[in-house]
Interface confidence: low
């Protein structure tokens, strides 16, 4: 039975050219996290594996940095980075937990962070 929940940074916005940290946190479960995948729609950005460490997809190596923690830092943001991002926790024995973050990259300086929220 899957008892865990994923807390994410929720809906966030950032300025073009800036950086943003995508964060997810898995709680309320004793399952072992074997790997975390970070994905943007259908593209895999990075993996953090319990045995293999961090690996950034070659397509994103210039603009994606691992961490902090199991989070992911996006750099040199462009308007094209606007969209949904997913943290996918592969755990044993529970299975897969998925968190969703929506990022909006703004041209202006009115970017501000949204509230945190829970995904059951």
């Amino acid at each position: 039975m899957m008892t865990g929940t994923i807390e994410t940074t929720g809906n966030i916005s950032a300025e073009k050219g800036g950086s943003i940290i995508l964060q997810c946190h898995l709680s309320s479960t004793t399952a072992q996290v074997t790997q975390v995948n970070w994905e943007q729609q259908d593209q895999l950005l990075a993996i953090c594996n319990a045995d293999l460490g961090w690996h950034i997809s070659p397509s994103f190596k210039d603009r994606v940095a691992p961490g902090p923690g199991l989070g992911l830092t996006l750099q040199s943001l462009t308007v094209n980075d606007t969209g949904e991002y997913f943290c996918i926790y592969h755990t044993y024995p529970d299975g897969t937990y998925t968190g969703r973050i929506f990022l909006e990259v703004l041209e202006s300086s009115v970017a501000e962070h949204g509230a945190r929220f829970q995904i059951p």
Epitope: Q35, I47, N49, L52, H55, I56, S57, P58, K61, Y92
Partner: nanobody, 120 residues
């Protein structure tokens, strides 16, 4: 299907060097994270070093940082582990592993292992 064949193990004195090779056949390495793992008698298998298919992202266990170097030759579909300043505690069977980017299980393709013995 990926077949992995390791070579380069042997007996070496403490402070010496060895270079392990892992030749892969069946698939290009571009789609894989390649790793070296080791297992000493009576101990669990542990990750030593990994490298992404593009060769630009590497990870090292703390116990080998600064002494071991992982590299890949994609043209030859071969991954290398250069081991310098070897210590008796590096004695183990060394295994090569290939893990696809969308890894969701604990293990994938493994070689048969090559013995490394470091004498004092």
């Amino acid at each position: 299907e990926v077949q992995l064949v390791e070579s380069g193990g042997g007996l070496v004195q403490a402070g010496g060097s060895l270079r392990l090779s892992c030749a892969a056949s069946g698939r290009t390495l571009d789609d894989y994270v390649m790793g070296w793992f080791r297992q000493a008698p009576g101990k669990e298998r542990e990750g030593v070093a990994t490298i992404s298919g593009g060769g630009d992202t590497t990870y090292y266990a703390d116990s080998v940082k600064g002494r071991f170097t992982i590299s890949a030759d994609n043209a030859k579909n071969t991954v290398y582990l250069q081991m310098n300043s070897l210590k008796p505690e590096d004695t183990a069977v060394y295994y090569c592993a290939a893990v696809p980017w969308r890894w969701t299980t604990r293990r994938d393709y493994w070689g048969q292992g090559t013995q490394v013995t470091v004498s004092s």
